[in-house]
Interface confidence: low
């Protein structure tokens, strides 16, 4: 960052999107600002308009190509600059040499579905979205189940330390409404973080049969 009150954070989704957030104490809300991306060794460059997300922070997405195109690799460096308009010219407010595969945040898993549900168990599957083939199987997942009367924050985390796009939830209560979420993280990257949580999947366990427990 150009000064101590500015924070500029970006993540690569491993395919064709870099999402950035810039926060600046005391910055003017009506200033027009952009993120400029200049890869060190590629023919293209890209710009996105920073839009306010709070009183002192702005965000934008650099769309590098079609969603599943592999636009960057582990040896790419992208110089990212925040440029804000000052009268007739642009002023550089922040800069970073961005290493895409050290700053990964994948898209949230999609296509959650109940494969099989019983009274005490539920088998759920999902798919990862726009994840690079470079990861091969080097991904991990976290999942959580929302029980009645609890909040998501109270839900215990279940960790899957391998690329496993399904889970069998056990010890559930019969005839009960639950919600389920999952997120994904590559093992690669010093500053890599978890994806957003998936959209919740609502499901209901089967009622217990009269006179017996299945």
């Amino acid at each position: 960052a150009v000064n101590g009150t500015s924070r500029f954070t970006c993540f690569y989704n491993s395919r064709a999107n870099i999402s950035c957030v810039w926060s600046q104490d005391g910055a003017l809300q009506d200033t027009s600002c952009q993120v400029h991306a200049w890869p060190d060794r590629r023919r293209w460059n890209q710009t996105c308009e920073l839009l306010p997300v709070s009183q002192a922070s702005w965000a934008c997405n650099l769309i590098l190509g079609t969603p599943d195109s592999q636009k960057l690799t582990a040896v790419d460096i992208v110089t990212l600059r925040v440029m804000c308009r000052e009268g007739v010219r642009w002023r550089m407010m922040a800069i970073q040499d961005f290493k895409p595969f050290e700053n990964l945040r994948l898209m949230a898993p999609i296509s959650l579905q109940v494969v099989h549900v019983e009274t005490h168990r539920c088998n759920i599957s999902w798919k990862i979205s726009q994840a690079s083939h470079y990861f091969e199987r080097h991904l991990e997942f976290e999942a959580r189940t929302l029980s009645p009367g609890h909040t998501w924050e109270e839900a215990p985390l279940m960790t899957l330390k391998q690329k496993q796009e399904w889970i069998c939830l056990e010890t559930l209560t019969p005839d009960t409404q639950y919600e389920f979420q999952v997120r994904v993280k590559p093992l690669q990257g010093e500053f890599t973080t978890w994806s957003p949580w998936s959209q919740p999947l609502a499901f209901r366990t089967k009622p217990a049969a009269l006179g017996k427990d299945t």
Epitope: V75, I77, Q96
Partner: antibody
Framework: EVQLLESGGGLVQPGGSLRLSCAAS????????VHWVRQAPGKGLEWLGV???????DYNAAFISRLTISKDNSKNTVYFQMNSLRAEDTAVYYC?????????????WGQGTLVTVSS | DIQMTQSPSSLSASVGDRVTITCQAS?????MYWYQQRPGKAPRLLIY???NLASGVPSRFSGSGSGTSYTFTISSLQPEDIATYYC?????????FGQGTKVEIK
């Protein structure tokens, strides 16, 4: 025309330091990365490190404890400093820049500067 | 580090001969580069991204390969091709070069 001009080579005592300069013309060091490569007499090429356009660096792990690459954007010049020199650091040191296209290698090289480490 | 092994280390051929140099990487690489270095001169880029000819390079030079095995060819050796040729990978850091192939005229 893109040009790179190294300077600062010469005789250095074992245990001493060297500071080389790479003056760039025809492009700005705020827009392109500059790499350093060396070649010992009669030997092959060895990549040492790079300073990226925004100012961050990557080093060959074999040299990370004694190597610093920096730059002065106002002078459009990149600097290479290596400490604790030994005889095996005797080499021609080159600065180099990749071209403009997608994955196009070291298209531009300086003429090299000879560093001799000897007492 | 990825080790690059060039073969042969030296060769002698006649003007007009077809010359082939191979470069074996210790693990798979995505992009291969080839340089020519004449005595006392800086290296010169000949081939980038495995098979693309650098600007101003004669068409008698070519490159091919994938994975761990790459090939550099001079289709018709000329007197000015006397030099040492190096391969280089740019898939992981540190960037590494082959040990070089010295080409001489018989």
């Amino acid at each position: 025309e893109v040009q790179l001009l190294e300077s600062g080579g010469g005789l250095v005592q074992p245990g001493g330091s060297l500071r080389l300069s790479c003056a760039a013309s025809g492009f700005t060091v705020t827009s392109y990365a500059v790499h350093w490569v060396r070649q010992a007499p009669g030997k092959g090429l060895e990549w040492l490190g790079v300073i990226w356009s925004g100012g961050s660096t990557d080093y060959n792990a074999a040299f990370i404890s004694r190597l610093t690459i920096s730059k002065d954007n106002s002078k459009n010049t990149v600097y290479f400093q290596m400490n604790s020199l030994r005889a095996e650091d005797t080499a021609v040191y080159y600065c180099a820049r990749a071209g403009d296209a997608n994955y196009d290698g070291f298209a531009y090289w300086g003429q090299g500067t000879l560093v001799t480490v000897s007492s | 580090d990825i080790q690059m092994t060039q073969s042969p280390s030296s060769l002698s051929a006649s003007v007009g001969d077809r010359v082939t140099i191979t470069c074996q990487a210790s693990s798979s690489v995505s992009f291969m580069y080839w340089y020519q270095q004449r005595p006392g001169k800086a290296p010169r880029l000949l081939i980038y991204d495995t098979s693309n000819l650098a600007s101003g390079v004669p068409s008698r030079f070519s490159g091919s390969g994938s994975g761990t095995s790459y090939t550099f060819t001079i289709s018709s050796l000329q007197p000015e091709d006397i030099a040492t040729y190096y391969c280089q990978q740019w898939s992981t850091y540190p960037l590494t070069f082959g040990q070089g192939t010295k080409v001489e005229i018989k």
